[in-house]
């Protein structure tokens, strides 16, 4: 509340975050031109990365795009991408949407159809959708620990959200248990109203917000935080605006003396910690 | 504008960036003692690094010190670093600017320098100038998507800067374009009043700032963003300061069962987004 | 000091942080049932990562498991995780502190005990306390160099912590030198009250305050930075709110056809820098 | 169903080597464990060697130095190589594995052991 009387201070935060769980992953794997069923386990070194403090990701879901290698090769036939002769292809020409700079020729993608050959990491990156339901649906269960230390240096005040008291084995409950900075992922998207299982196939951004309201009046002392949750990316956003959140990276390795990579489209949580508030003192 | 009956209030905000684009790089590779053209293509995997919201890097120059092992060398010879017997070397000393620990013997570098032995990745890496002009110097005509949410908590008021109405292949421009939230990166630095091509080399630091002046009373509400551009690193700085911008990275592998890698001190734009601004209502 | 004429606005930063510092790490080292002594050099792209720049992170100490592989093994014989018969084994459970899926079998873990059989990262990861004294404990050493470039935007003020007069071989010292903007890591502990050796071992969170009291008044300007240090993880933090700073990553490489991976419990010091303070005018 | 078929077994003379392998047969999800068992005459059978998934091996102090366990996981097979024979090496040598025959449903198979006999 706002006490005119008194001098307000932002607050200095720090933030520390903690992801626990494991997920079962069964998909269908296809080696040698045989298809069989691959199944999984993911800790956090497989689906979490380390990232600064007032932010976590976790991956939701993926698309791999195995064994690729520079070269020459036919692009993607995305929409408006065949062609039919050369007169198509335009040679150094780099197409935005594409992944590689045209050769100048038109050759065979499969049997039915012809593209853009292109200088790229061949075979280029098939654009297709992300797995429904998400590979890694079962993170709704993962819990992520927040540490946050705050300061208010003109008040010379400093405290932290865990204090010597709070139980080790809690999960914040937005009744039950609303200090308990233990949180399952599942149940902050619920808390914002959202579905999980939904989201993961995408992926998205969820903010959780620290507001800290201080009166650091000796007479009336109170400083404690208070959690809530709200879905950042626009769910409703078009296609041309790259709905959710994902991003690719790689994994680079060396066979037959020929440099490969594993290109691995992530999709996933980001999370968010926004602190805020401020403290009073007369 | 200072409207002093209004309550003022900070901009709570989170961004998410998409950067779009491939950069074809020509470089001299040696094999074998063999020097030859080497022509490959870089896409986001390969350029990029999943960092934090607020902040994105784009490399755009690299040297490479491949097939780096443990073991003994004689350190690179840089300016005082020579010797021409042993007295001159001090086993155990670290020197900040060298890479590895002397044995305390003089040996030769090459047929005409001797410079002391160091326990370290060797070969050490050679002290050359970042190559001129960068390797990936098309990525001036990379974009950038920048999706930016904000929250005035206590006006319990959210909003973002890309509306449902906004076209996906736009591109900002100061005059005909101001709310395109997607950036061509030679124009942000054009923006800026400085040379692409030329930070390219030594890597630097973009500021993009987005600036909320809201005003959130019902019958003059406006809340939209306005962005500018600042270069934020200093292109006057000393060398002994470290000018420009790149870190060193490592790619480990195991060879003849022999823990190598290389290492890349990539040179680049680190784009830091700067949100600011307030929330105001009677 | 607060001045009630002015037009206070708070600072707008950014931040980019060098890391120096070679570490000479000596471990026991097992290959094929032989145990050895080890001896590692460590230089800045194996102990640090790149961050954003308002958060620099510094590898203190480690544990690996390696050669890991997704197949069954007994769990890690924590306290309570034994077993002597399959009854009190569950198909399927996923216990939180395991690191694998329960598959209903209770099997040997080495001569004496028994243990869940799990599909998993096998061998999981022994539960062992990091090393003491932490292996690169000589990272007390390292140096880093911290640029920090403000802006008030409503003041259209820009400055840097780093002057043309600045010597780059200075150190940062409370007294001597207190605009030097190199600091040596134990010089921040030693500061804020903190026994670095200790710290290492388990990892911790520092923070490194840059204080901005500007008055921007031509006739009585001033405008320099301050900088102050604290511990901002909780050392008295019980056990099951993990103390100390670590996270866990993977290098992944492919042997013998079956995808493994080198497991890195990473034990570090995490700086966080806090930029605060307020530019004000007439 | 799931198989394990020895082969390589026979006769040969002290100081002499033989290779087995054990190949594993039938539709299952995952081998995992593998390993070299052997039954002297009147003896129990005792391990020789194992290995995992992951090529981390272990082998029996009598045979140690001497022998080596190998696997290809591309043709799910597990091999002996036994050099430096001795007459105490004589026995019948029975494969074992670990496989999974679906997600999570591990299964310990045996193979019907290969004669291994070692003489002058």
């Known amino acids: 509340s706002d006490k005119l009387y008194q001098r307000k201070e932002p607050v200095i935060s720090s933030v520390h975050t903690k992801v626990k769980g494991i997920a079962e992953v069964t998909e269908n794997v296809t080696e040698g031109g045989v298809t069989k069923l691959g199944h999984s386990i993911f800790d956090t070194a497989d689906y979490t990365f380390p990232l600064q403090g007032n932010s976590f990701f976790v991956m939701t879901n993926y698309v791999k795009s195995e064994g690729q290698v520079q070269t020459l090769c036919p692009e993607y036939p995305r929409r408006g991408a065949q062609c039919s002769s050369d007169r198509r292809c335009k040679k150094g020409w780099m197409d935005p949407q594409s992944k590689g700079i045209q050769t100048g020729r038109c050759v065979p993608y499969d049997k039915t159809r012809k593209t853009c050959e292109v200088s790229a990491w061949c075979p280029t990156e098939e654009e297709k959708e992300a797995p429904r339901p998400a590979l890694l649906r079962s993170a709704e269960n993962f819990t992520v620990l927040i540490k946050n230390n705050i300061h208010f240096p003109g008040h010379n005040y400093t405290t932290r959200n865990i204090l010597p008291t709070m139980n080790g084995s809690c999960t914040f409950h937005k009744t039950w248990d609303p200090q308990c900075s233990i949180f399952r992922l599942g149940d902050i998207f619920q808390e914002a109203g959202e579905n999980f299982t939904e989201v993961a196939v995408q992926g998205g951004i969820m903010g959780i917000e620290i507001y800290w309201d201080c009166n650091l009046d000796s007479w009336s002392h109170h400083c404690r935080p208070r959690y809530s949750f709200r879905r950042l990316d626009d769910k409703n956003m078009d296609e041309s605006f790259v709905p959710g959140y994902n991003f690719r990276y790689a994994k680079y390795y060396k066979e037959n003396n020929v440099e490969k990579r594993t290109l691995i489209k992530a999709f996933g949580i980001r999370f968010d910690i926004l602190v805020f508030g401020t403290g009073g003192k007369f | 504008s200072d409207k002093l009956y209004q309550r003022k209030e900070p901009v709570i905000s989170s961004v998410h960036t998409k950067v779009k684009g491939i950069a074809e790089v020509t470089e001299n590779v040696t094999e074998g003692g063999v020097t030859k053209l080497g022509h490959s293509i870089f896409d986001t995997a390969d350029y990029t690094f999943p960092l934090q919201g607020n902040s994105f890097f784009v490399m755009t120059n690299y040297v490479k010190s491949e097939g780096q092992v443990q073991t003994l060398c004689p350190e690179y010879p840089r300016r005082g670093a020579q010797c021409s017997s042993d007295r001159r070397c001090k086993k155990g000393w670290m020197d900040p600017q060298s890479k590895g620990i002397q044995t305390g013997r003089c040996v030769p570098y090459d047929k005409t320098r001797k410079t002391c032995e160091v326990s370290a990745w060797c070969p050490t890496e050679e002290e050359k100038e970042a190559p001129r002009p960068a390797l990936l110097r098309s990525a001036e005509n990379f974009t950038v998507l920048i999706k930016n949410n904000i929250h005035f908590p206590g006006h319990n008021y959210t909003t973002r800067n890309i509306l449902p109405t906004m076209n996906g292949s736009c591109t900002f421009h100061k005059t005909w374009d101001p709310q395109c939230s997607i950036f061509r990166l030679g124009d942000i630095f054009q923006e800026a009043g400085e040379n692409f091509t030329e930070v390219a080399v030594q890597g630097g630091i973009m500021g993009i700032e987005i600036y909320w002046d809201c005003n959130l009373d019902s019958w003059s509400h406006h809340c939209r963003p306005r962005y500018s551009f600042r270069r934020l690193d200093d292109k006057n700085m000393d060398e002994s300061f470290v000018p420009g911008y790149n870190f060193r990275y490592a790619k480990y592998y195991k060879e003849n069962n022999v823990e190598k890698r290389t290492l890349i001190k990539a040179f680049g734009i680190r784009f830091d987004i700067l949100v600011f601004g307030t929330g105001g209502k009677f | 000091s607060d001045k009630l004429y002015q037009r206070k606005e708070p600072v707008i930063s950014s931040v980019h942080t060098k890391v120096k510092g070679i570490a000479e790490v000596t471990e026991n080292v097992t290959e094929g049932g032989v145990t050895k002594l080890g001896h590692s050099i460590f230089d800045t792209a194996d102990y640090t990562f790149p961050l954003q720049g308002n958060s620099f992170f510094v590898m203190t100490n480690y544990v690996k498991s390696e050669g890991q592989v997704q197949t069954l093994c007994p769990e890690y014989p924590r306290r309570g995780a034994q077993c002597s018969s399959d009854r009190r084994c569950k198909k399927g459970w996923m216990d939180p502190q395991s690191k694998g899926i329960q598959t209903g079998r209770c099997v040997p873990y080495d001569k004496t005990r028994k243990t869940c059989e799990v599909s998993a990262w096998c061998p999981t990861e022994e539960e062992k306390e990091a090393p003491r004294p932490a292996l690169l404990r000589s990272a007390e050493n390292f140096t880093v160099l911290i640029k920090n470039n403000i802006h008030f935007p409503g003041h259209n003020y820009t400055t840097r912590n780093i002057l043309p007069t600045m010597n780059g071989s200075c150190t940062f010292h409370k007294t001597w030198d207190p605009q030097c903007s190199i600091f040596r890591l134990g010089d921040i502990f030693q500061e804020a009250g903190e026994n670095f050796t200790e710290v290492a071992v388990q990892g911790g969170i520092m923070g490194i305050e840059i204080y901005w009291d500007c008055n921007l008044d031509s006739w009585s300007h001033h405008c320099r930075p301050r900088y102050s240090f604290r511990r901002l993880d909780d050392k008295n933090m019980d056990e099951s709110f993990v103390p100390g700073y670590n996270f866990r990553y993977a290098k992944y490489y492919k042997e013998n056809n079956v995808e493994k991976r080198t497991l890195i419990k990473a034990f570090g010091i995490r700086f966080d820098i806090l930029v605060f303070g307020t530019g004000g005018k007439f | 169903e799931v198989q394990l078929v020895e082969s390589g077994g026979g006769l040969v003379q002290p100081g002499g080597s033989l290779r087995l392998s054990c190949a594993a047969s039938?539709?299952?999800?995952?081998?995992?464990?593998m390993a070299w068992y052997r039954q002297a005459p009147g003896k129990q059978r005792e391990l020789v060697a194992d290995?995992?998934?992951?090529?981390?091996?272990n082998y029996a102090d009598s045979v140690n130095g001497r022998f080596t366990i190998s696997r290809d996981n591309v043709r799910n097979t597990v091999y002996l190589q036994m050099n430096g024979l001795k007459p105490e090496d004589t026995a019948v040598y029975y494969c074992?594995?670990?496989?999974?025959?679906?997600?999570?449903?591990?299964?310990?198979?045996w193979g019907q052991g290969t004669q291994v006999t070692v003489s002058s």
């Open positions: 074992y594995a670990t496989i999974e025959l679906g997600v999570l449903e591990p299964r310990d198979y």
């Open positions: 039938g539709s299952f999800f995952r081998v995992n464990n």
């Open positions: 290995i995992t998934r992951g090529d981390r091996t």
